[in-house]
């Protein structure tokens, strides 16, 4: 655009003047003036702002408590904030990952169709016919039943979704 | 306070190219648009185009199209200007220069508030 | 492009005199115009933006008026420091163009 119809994009108005924005890991002291330009401070130790800005204190790093499962997966800089996950076993309860819950077994008759990470819960599905889950696992998948037929072999108890076939000697014709 | 401190001068033979460095400091680089601007021995000045350093992207004058590339590296809040296939009449004093905004009655009214020293290119065979 | 014409283009003056210098814009331009000086060897310094505003630390003996196509800029009382040229620019339009120049000599 010829003339400018605003600041330009790292630029603030104040006071009819366009000011520098900080940039990220800085904190605004202060404006820019006809005489001065923008005052700029880095952020502290565990202190931290993300975008160019005019904020006047830096935002805290995030704390990742222990108490609720929580452990750092990526620590914290002067442009960013503190990634937190969740101890092994537990998973996050949000996006945010304030708190961790513990990951989720899948019941006799399911088994796991994606195991849990930091982030997301254990999936379960039920087990298809011809296969079953005789636990309850969060690392489990449903196992095949058992393949009477190739242990020379035949079926003498069907299996479902929680048992396994039961397999059994075939029937001798006696002379 | 605000610095542009631009490199030193130069001689260059008919069709080579030149790059001109301009090193700022005392402000935030990324915050304010870059121009350049050059002086022909005993003339007037004539206005060569802009950077925006925070993306990288230049607007060039026509007369320059083609033949001008305007650059810079914000890690070192440094801009330059290259003129590639250099004539005589390219013979001029390059200056780098600072956008300024004033906003009043409704209005965003830029001018160029601090310049480099300039940077001599001299173009002869 | 916009042309902008300046008078006179030489000006021979002496100290404590009221000069004027005018800029003539080939279309208009509103207010955006700005004035610089500039001394031998030196980059131009940037007097009055926005057609009447001064930049800060300009002494107050300058002043710039003006709208539209017609501009000018009053030295009230010249002092010996004020010999220079002194240019006007258009930044209503790409590309910013400048006028050719008014040269202010000591009578």
């Known amino acids: 655009p010829e003339p400018p119809t605003a600041c330009r994009e790292k630029q603030y108005l104040i006071n009819s003047q366009c000011c520098s924005l900080c940039q990220p890991g800085q904190k605004l002291v202060s404006d820019c003036t006809e005489f001065t330009e923008t005052e700029c401070l880095p952020c502290g130790e565990s202190e931290f702002l993300d975008t160019w800005n005019r904020e006047t204190h830096c935002h805290q790093h995030k704390y990742c408590d222990p108490n609720l499962g929580l452990r750092v997966q990526q620590k914290g800089t002067s442009e960013t904030d503190t990634i937190c996950t969740c101890e092994e076993g537990w998973h996050c309860t949000s996006e945010a990952c304030e708190s961790c819950v513990l990951h989720r077994s899948c019941s006799p008759g399911f088994g796991v169709k994606q195991i849990a990470t930091g982030v997301s819960d254990t999936i379960c599905e039920p087990c298809p016919v011809g296969f079953f889950s005789n636990v309850s696992s969060a690392f489990e998948k449903c196992h095949p039943w058992t393949s009477c037929e190739t242990k020379d072999l035949v079926v003498q108890q069907a299996g479902t979704n929680k048992t396994d076939v039961v397999c059994g000697p075939q029937d001798r014709l006696r002379a | 306070q605000v610095q542009l401190v631009q490199s030193g001068a130069e001689v260059k033979k008919p069709g080579a190219s030149v790059k001109v460095s301009c090193k700022a400091s005392g402000y935030t680089f990324a915050g304010y648009y870059m121009y350049w601007v050059r002086q022909a021995p005993g003339q007037g000045l004539e206005w060569m185009g802009w950077i925006n350093p925070d993306s990288g992207a230049p607007t060039y004058a026509q007369k320059f199209q083609g033949r001008v590339t305007m650059t810079r590296d914000t890690s070192i809040s440094t801009a330059y200007m290259e003129l590639s296939r250099l004539r005589s009449d390219d013979t001029a004093v390059y200056y780098c220069a600072r956008e300024k905004i004033y906003y009043g009655s409704g209005n965003y009214y830029p001018s160029f508030d601090y310049w480099g020293q300039g940077t001599l290119v001299t173009v002869s065979s | 492009d916009i042309q902008l014409t300046q008078s006179p283009s030489f000006l021979s003056a002496s100290v404590g005199d009221r000069v004027t210098i005018t800029c003539r814009a080939s279309q208009g331009i509103s207010s955006y115009l700005a004035w610089y000086q500039q001394k031998p060897g030196k980059a131009p310094k940037l007097l009055i933006y926005?057609?009447?505003t001064l930049q800060s630390g300009v002494p107050s003996r300058f002043s710039g008026s003006g709208s539209g196509t017609e501009f000018t800029l009053t030295i009230s009382s010249l002092q010996p420091e004020d010999f220079a040229t002194y240019y006007c620019?258009?930044?209503?339009?790409?590309?910013?163009?400048f006028g050719q120049g008014t040269k202010v000599e000591i009578k």
């Open positions: 620019q258009q930044l209503w339009s790409y590309p910013w163009t």
């Open positions: 926005a057609a009447s």
